[in-house]
Interface confidence: medium
């Protein structure tokens, strides 16, 4: 299995980063960590999503990964899809610095990330709180401001 | 079982530096935000900066920019908050605290047990 | 810098009654707001994260509301232990800030 993997993260407009991920043990966690700059200051939802496509940018990579067909929820709810790993908080200068560690996603087996896409948000994810059908799939967490492919890494 | 545990309690001369240390056991210290907290006698609480320890990056009120320094060492798992050109309004307890969940709950669920300093002549 | 004002700033009250203190924002942080408990010569502890969700441990009693600007920590059902001074705080954006406090005394 791999331990290790890495997406660098791509947008048409100024948003840019690059995260890291480590999980040491197969069924134990996931360090994620990294910068994104060019967001506006506040918070961004941060997700992944279904496919590895970005043939047609951003929106191709699909839904929130979600095998177990649950509803969209915050990383710490049980209620959540696999993909949902939250928000990430930019500073005034637009640098959002990413630090995470989430016991659901994972880099083997049915929860694994690799091959899918890794998205950054217009607007902050509402955990699915926001009272309304979109909260419960999305966070109404907008359009996607970048995004990229997570793969395998040395 | 989390536990952020501080140094002792400091007295200070004006225009000196303390620097308070926060040494953390259970969950991966690395990935873990870690944030001070000041609270002056009496008055209310104040967020002074945070430390992401994997990145080293930091984040810091606009209030204390250019005196606080944060730093990390993964190696101890320990966490510290330098204030420099000290003036008696900085006499307090200074906290460190971190969220259950590194999952940028950004709120503080661990808190140290405080570390008084007192600023004198 | 994202202004946090609560009231009351103080507050007397008896076991079981019911208590709700507000906390307003100088602008709109969506739900990213949370509560503290903080006893004298302790450590604040945490109650509520995201206004609502109630912290793992902490008892039903407590819960949060609000979103936007405008928020609520209500105490259904006071007890003796609960007696403290309570804070909420916006995690929106930085700096991340503090309301003054409201003290909750046994009247």
């Known amino acids: 299995m791999a331990t290790k993997a890495v997406c660098v993260l791509k947008g048409d407009g100024p948003v840019q980063g690059i995260i890291n991920f480590e999980q040491k043990e197969s069924n134990g966690p996931v360090k994620v960590w990294g910068s994104i700059k060019g967001l506006t200051e506040g918070l961004h939802g941060f997700h992944v999503h279904e496919f590895g496509d970005n043939t047609a940018g951003c929106t191709s990579a699909g839904p929130h990964f979600n095998p177990l067909s649950r509803k969209h929820g915050g990383p710490k709810d049980e209620e959540r899809h696999v993909g949902d790993l939250g928000n990430v908080t930019a500073d005034k200068d637009g640098v959002a610095d990413v630090s995470i560690e989430d016991s659901v996603i994972s880099l083997s087996g049915d929860h694994c990330i690799i091959g899918r896409t890794l998205v950054v948000h217009e607007k902050a994810d509402d955990l699915g709180k926001g009272g309304n059908e979109e909260s419960t799939k999305t966070g109404n967490a907008g359009s996607r401001l970048a995004c990229g492919v997570i793969g395998i890494a040395q | 079982q989390v536990q952020l545990v501080q140094s002792g309690a400091e007295v200070k001369k004006p225009g000196s530096s303390v620097k308070v240390s926060c040494k953390a056991s259970g969950g991966s210290f690395s990935i873990y935000v870690i944030s001070w907290v000041r609270q002056a006698p009496g008055q209310g609480l104040e967020w002074m900066g945070r430390i992401i320890p994997i990145l080293g990056t930091t984040n810091y009120a606009q209030k204390f920019q250019g005196r606080v320094t944060i730093t990390a060492d993964k190696s101890t798992s320990t966490a510290y908050m330098e204030l420099s050109s000290l003036r008696s309004e900085d006499t307090a307890v200074y906290y460190c605290?971190?969220?259950?969940?590194?999952?940028?709950?950004?709120?503080?669920?661990?808190w140290g047990q405080g570390t008084l300093v007192t600023v004198s002549s | 810098d994202i202004q946090m004002t609560q009231s009351p700033s103080s507050l007397s009250a008896s076991v079981g009654d019911r208590v709700t203190i507000t906390c307003r924002a100088s602008?709109?942080?969506?739900?990213?707001l949370a509560w503290y408990q903080q006893k004298p010569e302790k450590a604040p502890k945490s109650l509520i994260y995201?206004?609502?969700s109630l912290q793992s441990g902490v008892p039903s009693r407590f819960s949060g509301s609000g979103s936007g600007t405008d928020f609520t920590l209500t105490i259904s059902s006071l007890q003796p232990e609960d007696f403290a001074t309570y804070y909420c705080q916006q995690y929106n954006s930085y700096p991340y800030t503090f309301g003054q406090g409201t003290k909750l005394e046994i009247k």
């Open positions: 995201g206004a609502s």
């Open positions: 605290a971190r969220p259950d969940s590194p999952n940028h709950s950004n709120t503080f669920d661990y």
């Open positions: 602008q709109g942080i969506s739900s990213w």
